[in-house]
Interface confidence: medium
Amino acid sequence: KSSNEATNITPKHNMKAFLDELKAENIKKFLYNFTQIPHLAGTEQNFQLAKQIQSQWKEFGLDSVELAHYDVLLSYPNKTHPNYISIINEDGNEIFNTSLFEPPPPGYENVSDIVPPFSAFSPQGMPEGDLVYVNYARTEDFFKLERDMKINCSGKIVIARYGKVFRGNKVKNAQLAGAKGVILYSDPADYFAPGVKSYPDGWNLPGGGVQRGNILNLNGAGDPLTPGYPANEYAYRRGIAEAVGLPSIPVHPIGYYDAQKLLEKMGGSAPPDSSWRGSLKVPYNVGPGFTGNFSTQKVKMHIHSTNEVTRIYNVIGTLRGAVEPDRYVILGGHRDSWVFGGIDPQSGAAVVHEIVRSFGTLKKEGWRPRRTILFASWDAEEFGLLGSTEWAEENSRLLQERGVAYINADSSIEGNYTLRVDCTPLMYSLVHNLTKELKSPDEGFEGKSLYESWTKKSPSPEFSGMPRISKLGSGNDFEVFFQRLGIASGRARYTKNWETNKFSGYPLYHSVYETYELVEKFYDPMFKYHLTVAQVRGGMVFELANSIVLPFDCRDYAVVLRKYADKIYSISMKHPQEMKTYSVSFDSLFSAVKNFTEIASKFSERLQDFDKSNPIVLRMMNDQLMFLERAFIDPLGLPDRPFYRHVIYAPSSHNKYAGESFPGIYDALFDIESKVDPSKAWGEVKRQIYVAAFTVQAAAETLSEVA
């Protein structure tokens, strides 16, 4: 069968028809519709939005649209006992209290059910003690404190600024340092770009604005009570003491007005260097405790949030494939938001909605994709990627046999400067070819391709004339598909200029000020960047679902494997004597990479030449491409992280958002000179090299001629 059997127009025209159907005005309208009230996971409002999306996707023409529900652990503030932090004097009197809520933005004063700022899954507690300022609370910040400055965080409340790494890693680091509470705050150095006004007059964070967010360390487990299995009606749930990834100490976020009041009194050690200073008019002393006259004052946290098993709802839409209905290309993004979700997630959900509408329009004209396309509106992403993970756990056997690709669709924008793509190397060529066909929305690049503006503004650090494409980390719904199941994945959005804007994420991230107006007034008034992101995400899905031969190039994997092997080898070579003493060799890894390169090259040659009219051979070659990503999965997972099973990529152990290459070897080598037992530590390095070399070799062999 040809891929056009279900239609009377050529594939090229199909793609053009699909892209031409995408309209900026529709995305704008959908964004407005999705952002008028909060859609917090587990609430009635979010359930109603799920039903609305289900109904509209059906109208758009999908074959079926179902709700998939799960009962998962969520976390909410106590409505009658608000969370706050106070400074108390020696008599225990509260002489300063942090604010209980963010001042609502203009036009939203009467909106109900705005959840106050809180750290989701914080345990309850009222610890009091001296404060220690720990910078970003990264691994290296605690090394500086404990090893260099000899400051002991045990029994202290630590205050850390948001940014650089996932907040859950900050909390984990604080726990390991012995802290009894964590205060997270947004420093203007990270969340207030110079020369821009604060909301509502600009896109900067006002002093009363606060970033919400979960503080779990799930490592890919999904629902903390049902790791590995779906949280369905007959689920066996762990007790809360055995739940995965919950923090053990109270945590609470504040804005920079409140942070100023805590930090201005800090005494003790001066900051070790300028990288520990933010932009507040405070000394950024590390502590412990307050200075001089204030030394008898303490900080007290009052945290009363509760963890509750709550029902969540995914929306799953299906557009059946005409030729290979048992091959799935998935486009998914979340629907739940902390408050209005102006950017996160609804700028992404609006794009997905328009992509569904465009595909539905083509379907109504008699067209079908070659492969099945699944569309997903995930719930409870903000609470730990729960909706996507539970659905993938429930459908893991189908997905591992049938999953071709997963394209993520959270926030479409985090800036309006250039494109940002993170994906498997298998998709590099797809992304390059697609962006060469799309028009750039950027000023000064009229009539030029998206590829050209992207390459100019975000050049690859390795290859001239090519754009930067980053490794997949985590912190979003692709995690279970890529890191656990080994399904080729990618994500794309418009981003800021990282050279000139050093702040973390976008300033209003997870605050009440993330509104429709923020996007419409300041980020993308014409919705041209949203449209471009829709074209990239939609175009990738279209090609993955419709091209006769899957648009994966295994040679690009060979290139990065060599780069990653070189990188990890150079890290290890910082310890030449130990490598000699313990007979540590990377020969097996480099040999496997060489074999992979040669086999991938031969496979690519065969891919050019084979008879595409023979459906059996076509399916065989496509299966080799589809299963290549799967071949990098180790069923045993990474040490202490059983749900991170990809041997080439995993979220960094020090920052969930970042991707790490050869993570097993990297973690074994990390800070190895501090390991008490060097023989054991270097033994683990050798074991991880063995696992990596075996996996690369095994993956290479899946590309060999089958007989």
Epitope: N152, K574, E673
Partner: antibody
């Protein structure tokens, strides 16, 4: 095999000075923080000083009992760490051990006797 | 300074017996506690690190446990060569400190 070998101990008069040395082998010396720990019948095991690696700016830390009287130093090109001891007192009499970070490997020790 | 207190100062054991040595920290040191064995005329050798991890080459009759302030070294079946001195030490914070030692003697 990790080896630490101290030398330079001996008899010294109160108020005098002495420099003891430790040569390391079997590991990438420049990566590691090094310590001196001493042992006497009166005080038992007592940590004396630590010197960090180049990446930690060769930071040094000392026990209160020796602060201002001893200097720890290192020469990565010779895989050696030193302890310069001044204004020695009778209570500094001990076997001095050179140890690698977290005291997981110890040398055989060198004896310093402060006596008139 | 964190004071590490070991008790008893000495104890008698027979071959094959199970022995428990105790170490108490004056404040919370997490699990940053090591145990050392010292034979006459030799330097101390690490047995246990991180409160419960056996160091390379240490026989599995030695085990450690505890966290916070209370730590235990257990010898499941004492051998004649184990009748020597044992020290605990903390590397949680400066100054690193050691216990006064426990001498294991023949019954």
């Amino acid at each position: 095999e990790v080896k630490l070998e101290e030398s330079g101990g001996g008899l010294v008069q109160p108020g005098g000075s002495m420099k003891i040395s430790c040569v390391a082998s079997g590991f990438t010396f420049s990566n590691y923080w090094m310590n001196w720990v001493r042992q006497s019948p009166e005080k038992g095991l007592e940590w004396v000083a630590e010197i960090r690696s180049q990446s930690n700016n060769f930071a040094t830390h000392y026990a209160e009992s020796v602060k201002g009287r001893v200097i720890i130093s290192r020469d990565d090109s010779k895989s050696s760490v030193y302890l310069q001891m001044n204004s020695l007192r009778a209570e500094d009499t001990a076997v001095y051990y050179c140890t690698r970070r977290w005291n997981n490997f110890w040398g055989q020790g060198t004896t310093v006797t402060v006596s008139s | 300074n964190i004071v590490m207190t070991q008790f008893p100062k000495s104890m008698s054991a027979s071959a094959g017996e199970r022995m428990t040595l105790t170490c108490k920290a004056s404040e919370n040191v997490g699990t940053y506690v090591s145990w050392y064995q010292q034979k006459p005329t030799q330097s101390p050798k690490m047995l246990i690190y991180g409160a419960s991890n056996r160091f390379t080459g240490v026989p599995d009759r030695f085990s450690g446990s505890g966290s916070g302030t209370d730590f235990i070294l257990t010898i499941s079946s004492v051998q004649a060569e184990d009748l020597v001195d044992y020290y605990c030490g903390q590397s949680y914070t400066f100054p690193y400190t050691f216990g006064g030692g426990t001498k294991l003697e023949m019954k």
